[in-house]
């Protein structure tokens, strides 16, 4: 889970081992800081829970893609 208590950078030390339904998701952010042990994606759920996920997993990439597509404002 995210840990930012003693550091200015939020890092992930463990990844969720279950796929999260996209229905649960509100947003995500990528963790790429060299101060963190591994690259990660932190999903924020619609009830404001933060969940660390492995960006190498296909479901994580698909979920980010889904959020990206629906977040874009349609051009008029």
């Amino acid at each position: 889970q995210p840990d930012a208590i003693n550091a200015p950078v939020t890092c992930c030390y463990n990844f969720t081992n279950r796929k999260i339904s996209v229905q649960r998701l509100a947003s995500y952010r990528r963790i790429t800081s060299s101060k963190c042990p591994k690259e990660a994606v932190i999903f924020k759920t619609i009830v404001a829970k933060e969940i660390c996920a492995d960006p190498k997993q296909k479901w994580v990439q698909d979920s980010m893609d889904h959020l990206d597509k629906q977040t874009q404002t349609p051009k008029t």
Epitope: S21, V22, Q23, S27, I46
Partner: antibody, heavy 119, light 112 residues
């Protein structure tokens, strides 16, 4: 299509408990959180809390902590809310609802039960 | 808790005319992720609530495009471009940015 079917009206005594059910159909209940909302007669809406049916995680509004207990049974696609220590202030319609900002090709969705009246 | 204040509380409107409802929050609803979790609900007489708008301005499926939402920070507006008879009911704003989720006190729309 998605439906949330709540149990029937309840007439209860002060100090007693009541357990309301919300049966989901048309989607996998484990895929999303189930929320509960209170509406007193002629009044507005109050959020009670949510349950994650997949693992039983819950979160309650401070006002309802200790009075409301949310549970779910994925095998029967049913969510439950138990209210204890009932008083006249708890006479209300209680709604279950599930919603998302994303999740379909169109975008978000929101579904509500028909409400259970507790008197 | 975040207080959501709606105005007016009662809104008599002539059929075919526009209507506007204001919702002000006691704190900004802009979340740390850059999104604003402000929604609008409609509750017709004797019915369950129904979400009309989410994330300030996105219309739910099946909601007529005469409804629109706008705003940012602490000030939000629901507009109906031309009121129809089926629009009668109570409208609530609802925030999901801060715990616990809270609702406005409701605006009752009626036909003049």
């Amino acid at each position: 299509q998605v439906q949330l079917l709540e149990s029937g009206a309840e007439l209860v005594r002060p100090g007693s408990s009541v357990k309301i059910s919300c049966k989901a159909s048309g989607y996998a209940i484990k895929d999303n959180y189930m929320h509960w909302v209170k509406q007193r007669p002629g009044q507005g809406l109050e959020w009670i809390g949510w349950i994650d049916p997949e693992n039983g995680d819950t979160e309650y509004a401070p006002k309802f902590q200790g009075q409301a207990t949310l549970t779910a049974d994925t095998s029967s696609s049913t969510a439950y809310m138990q209210l204890s220590g009932l008083t006249s202030e708890d006479s209300a319609v209680y709604y279950c609802n599930t919603w998302a900002y994303y999740g379909t090709s169109y975008g978000g969705f929101a579904y509500w039960g028909q409400g259970t009246t507790v008197t | 808790d975040i207080v959501m204040t709606q105005s007016p509380l009662s809104l008599p409107v002539t059929l075919g005319q526009p209507a506007s409802i204001s919702c002000k929050s006691s704190q900004s609803l802009l979340d740390s992720d850059g999104k604003t979790y402000l929604n609008w609900l409609q509750q017709r007489p004797g019915q369950s609530p129904r979400r009309l708008i989410y994330l300030v301005s996105k219309l739910d499926s099946g909601v007529p495009d005469r409804f629109s939402g706008s705003g940012s920070g602490t000030d939000f507006t629901l507009k109906i471009s031309r009121v129809e008879a089926e629009d009668v009911g109570v409208y609530y704003c609802w925030q999901g940015t801060h715990f616990p989720q809270t609702f406005g006190q409701g605006t009752k729309l009626e036909i003049k």
